[in-house]
């Protein structure tokens, strides 16, 4: 899977969208690795 900064950000956006935004506050692009997905 793509793990560039842009890919990580888009993947996290999709995850937040699907979860309705109900995730931890520190779950942000710069504080997660590709393994978080």
């Amino acid at each position: 899977a793509c793990d560039t900064a842009t890919c990580v950000t888009h993947r996290l956006a999709g995850l937040l969208s699907r979860s309705g935004g109900v995730v931890k506050n520190n779950f942000v692009p710069t504080n997660v690795g590709s393994k978080a997905f």
């Epitope: 937040l16 942000v28 692009p29």
Partner: antibody, heavy 119, light 107 residues
Framework: EVQLVQSGAEVKKPGASVKVSCKAS????????MNWVRQAPGQRLEWIGV????????TYNRKFKGRATLTVDKSASTAYMELSSLRSEDTAVYYC????????????WGQGTTVTVSS | DIQMTQSPSSLSASVGDRVTITCKAS??????VAWYQQKPGKSPKALIY???YRYSGVPSRFSGSGSGTDFTLTISSLQPEDVATYHC?????????FGQGTKLEIK
């Protein structure tokens, strides 16, 4: 309102260095990566590198590795791009850009900083 | 590095026309492609991400498609304010790379 406000135009001599700043506001600066891109006259956009403002970790386009240095001042929500050993081919508009999720899912760009390298 | 080849490099079309710009990657980049619009003297403005998703606020006449190596940006009905240069970008691999741009003019 999200804003990326860059420093003003610079004129430099060949061999000198330039440091461009990008002041972020309207979002949590350390949550999102900051990219730097340049556009020389009549040329395609060219990616310089990216910095994680939370950790300071950088990834560079190898074309610029050793000449470009990306840094941040977290307390000032400001990113910096320094380019050394300038040559005429470095004459370009330099942009900072950050892809955000919050407050709005959008790819924001600074207004650009013109760097002219001339003897 | 991945080469992104855009075509055409310039085109002229009439208001209301359907306009298609293509971008070919030198290797498979999945759907990790963005499209930007740049007006003279301005910063690029993001239109499309992940090959086919429009950012909020981007008019619905702009659409993107493609995967792998072949990508397309379509303007379904050209408007005067669409005069600009359009850039594709792959972000699947470092370094991110851009197409050479397509300059769009009104006939």
């Amino acid at each position: 309102e999200v804003q990326l406000v860059q420093s003003g135009a610079e004129v430099k001599k060949p061999g000198a260095s330039v440091k461009v700043s990008c002041k972020a506001s309207g979002y949590t600066f350390t949550d999102y990566y900051m990219n730097w891109v340049r556009q020389a006259p009549g040329q395609r956009l060219e990616w310089i590198g990216v910095i994680n403002p939370y950790s300071g970790r950088t990834t560079y386009n190898r074309k610029f590795k050793g000449r470009a240095t990306l840094t941040v001042d977290k307390s000032a929500s400001t990113a910096y791009m320094e380019l050394s050993s300038l040559r005429s081919e470095d004459t370009a508009v330099y942009y900072c850009a950050s892809l955000l999720i919050r407050p709005h899912y959008f790819d924001y760009w600074g207004q650009g900083t013109t760097v002219t390298v001339s003897s | 590095d991945i080469q992104m080849t855009q075509s055409p490099s310039s085109l002229s079309a009439s208001v209301g026309d359907r306009v298609t710009i293509t971008c070919k990657a030198s290797q498979n980049v999945g759907t990790n492609v963005a499209w930007y619009q740049q007006k003279p003297g301005k910063s690029p403005k993001a239109l499309i991400y992940s090959a086919s998703y429009r950012y909020s606020g981007v008019p619905s006449r702009f659409s993107g498609s493609g995967s792998g190596t072949d990508f397309t940006l379509t303007i379904s009905s050209l408007q005067p304010e669409d005069v600009a240069t359009y850039h594709c970008q792959q972000y699947n691999f470092y370094p991110y790379t851009f197409g050479q741009g397509t300059k769009l003019e009104i006939k």
